[in-house]
């Protein structure tokens, strides 16, 4: 959960206010109580965004675009809040807001800039292009430009590519990277720097197994405590690699703590779940379940892949059959 | 009974700073704004910008920015405005007065005249 | 900027005489107007503020009106001491204007 807005204090009579997509923010000023009270919001010394004088707010002059989008404290006026209350924020609102106060006995103003930044949660994908495989750290929508970070085995690697398309008002960004043939642990971060929000990716690929047809296998899957905090909502979702895409096998949601099973040979452990621990069991297994299994724990502010490789061979009845 | 008392002249050459004085009596000094109106013929009365004590806040009319600096002392109850790069156009009367949005007393004035 | 715009540079009256001094705004100002009257070789002194609210100690013969964008003035009987520059003034937003002022004759 984040705050409405955070405040960062310049010198003089000027404010940072960082406000996030879509959401509510506040632009502070405050001044030494008095009566006849009038308030101006301007923004760049220029747009009519608020006033209010004799009592009551007079909107008829507003810019067009903060229609229904301010307001003030009114209970709070005379105790000198002239702070301005702001409905959902877009990257068009950034820029320069002065707060004039006139009484009877003061004048101030208060110039307040507002960055607005965007965060949609990324997302780390594991993909199979014809022979190769690919990690993809992606984000929808983020603002400012981020920082995108790749490691290997925690050491950091240079090879970054990032497929960059810029909207209006955010950028989206792929960071591929090919991991064919590596067995090597990897790590993704991206940090947006005005939002001071970091998100990072971690995907690990276990060693093959070689199971025979009929048998059952156990695959774990536990988080890494670096990242992982169970009070915070995440999903943990296991699904199957087959030719090329993946089939959801069940999926696991902190909030509700709801299991949803769509392979019935598939089992989960309640208890090890309530230990943090999503390892799974395929039962009765048949040949078209080699292949590749993920473990994709996510939340906010992390997504934890795990990767099995399983190989299912005849039993010595089935060959004999043949 | 509110009082400003500002020097009656001031005469600085051209490209010379001048700082005014304006010191105030009667009232809590630290509560109200002060305020800096020029008056020439041509021009009339115009307002150059405003200080409140309390906090130091200062607003200025666009058109004296960089010309005029406002601060204010509050241990002595004066304010002071800085004017710099001096020249002709700057000869005026120049009047503290304090308020809030209207200025409820005035200084006498101080004549500034710049010349060589 | 919000200016102010006295039309009439000089009026002349006579004493007794009920005169009107006018000023316009360039947009609505509601009715966040002062007026002040300067005589010869003194420091403006406020008069009237919010368009027609009196300041302390200031004569029932100077009443203030209007709103929005028009304001006047009036002295009721004019007398001699009245002689003087009179300045409209907006405090509705900053930078505050002030009018070009009218100056009164007594004839």
């Known amino acids: 959960i984040f705050p409405l807005a955070f405040f960062i204090y310049v010198p003089m009579n000027e404010q940072i206010v960082i406000g996030r997509l879509d959401e509510d923010i506040i632009l502070p000023s405050s001044f030494e109580r008095g009566s006849e009270v009038v308030i101006h919001w301007k923004y760049q010394d220029s747009y009519k965004v608020h006033s209010y004088y004799k009592g009551s707010d007079h909107l008829e002059s507003q810019d067009p675009r903060y229609a229904n989008r301010t307001s003030l404290f009114y209970n709070e006026i005379q105790n000198g809040n002239a702070s301005l209350f702001f409905r959902r924020v877009s990257l068009l609102d950034e820029g320069i807001y002065t707060c004039y106060v006139g009484t009877a006995i003061q004048v101030i103003t208060n110039k307040v800039v507002l960055k607005v930044g965007v965060f949609l949660t990324p997302v780390m994908k594991y993909e199979k292009r014809n022979t190769n495989s690919f990690l993809i750290c992606s984000v929808l929508s983020v603002y400012p430009r981020p920082i995108i970070t790749w490691k290997m085995d925690n050491t950091p690697i240079s090879e970054n590519n990032m497929e960059e398309t810029g909207s209006l008002d955010s950028f989206s960004i792929n960071s591929p990277l090919n991991i064919t043939g590596s067995n090597s642990s990897y790590e993704c971060t991206i940090e947006n720097s005005l939002l001071k929000q970091t998100w990072t990716g971690r995907w690990t690929m276990k060693d093959g197994l070689h199971k025979m047809q009929s048998e059952h296998v156990s695959l774990s899957c536990q988080p890494v405590n670096d990242y992982f905090s169970p009070n915070q909502d995440f999903k943990v979702t296991w699904s199957r690699m087959k030719s090329g895409t993946f089939s959801v096998l069940a999926y696991y949601l902190s909030s509700s703590q709801n299991t949803i099973i769509n392979e019935s040979r598939f089992s989960w452990n309640k208890e090890l779940i309530n230990q943090s621990d999503f390892s799974m069991n395929l039962m009765d297994l048949n040949l078209s379940d080699s292949g590749e299994y993920l473990c994709n724990i996510s939340s906010d502010e992390y997504t934890l892949l795990t990767i099995h490789t399983v190989h299912v061979e005849p039993s010595q009845e089935t060959a004999s059959h043949n | 009974q509110e009082q400003l008392q500002q020097p009656g002249t001031e005469l600085v050459k051209p490209g010379a700073s001048v700082k005014i004085s304006c010191k105030a009596s009667?009232?809590?000094?630290?509560?109200?704004?002060m305020h800096w109106v020029k008056l020439t013929p041509g021009q009339g009365l115009e307002w150059m910008g405003t200080?409140?004590?309390?906090?130091?806040?200062?607003s200025y009319n666009q058109k004296f920015k960089g010309k005029a600096t406002l601060t204010a002392d509050k241990s002595s109850s004066t304010a002071y405005m800085q004017l710099s790069s001096l020249t002709s156009e700057d000869s005026a009367v120049y009047y503290c007065?304090?308020?809030?949005?209207?200025?409820?007393?005035w200084g006498q004035g101080t004549t500034l005249t710049v010349s060589s | 900027d919000i200016v102010m715009t006295q039309s009439h540079k000089f009026l002349s009256t006579s004493v007794g005489d009920r005169v009107s001094i006018t000023c316009k705004a360039s947009q609505d100002v509601s009715t966040a107007v002062a007026w002040y009257q300067q005589k010869p070789g003194q420091s403006p002194k406020l008069l009237i503020y919010?368009?027609?609210t009196r300041h302390t100690g200031v004569s029932d013969r100077f009443t203030g009106s209007g709103s929005g964008t028009d304001f006047t003035l009036t002295i009721s009987s004019v007398q001699a001491e009245d002689l003087a520059l009179y300045y409209c003034q907006q405090h509705f937003d900053i930078p505050y204007w002030f009018g070009g002022g009218t100056k009164l004759e007594i004839k």
């Open positions: 007065a304090r308020g809030g949005y209207y200025f409820d007393y």
């Open positions: 919010w368009a027609s």
């Open positions: 009667g009232y809590t000094f630290s509560s109200y704004s």
């Open positions: 200080i409140y004590p309390g906090n130091e806040n200062t």
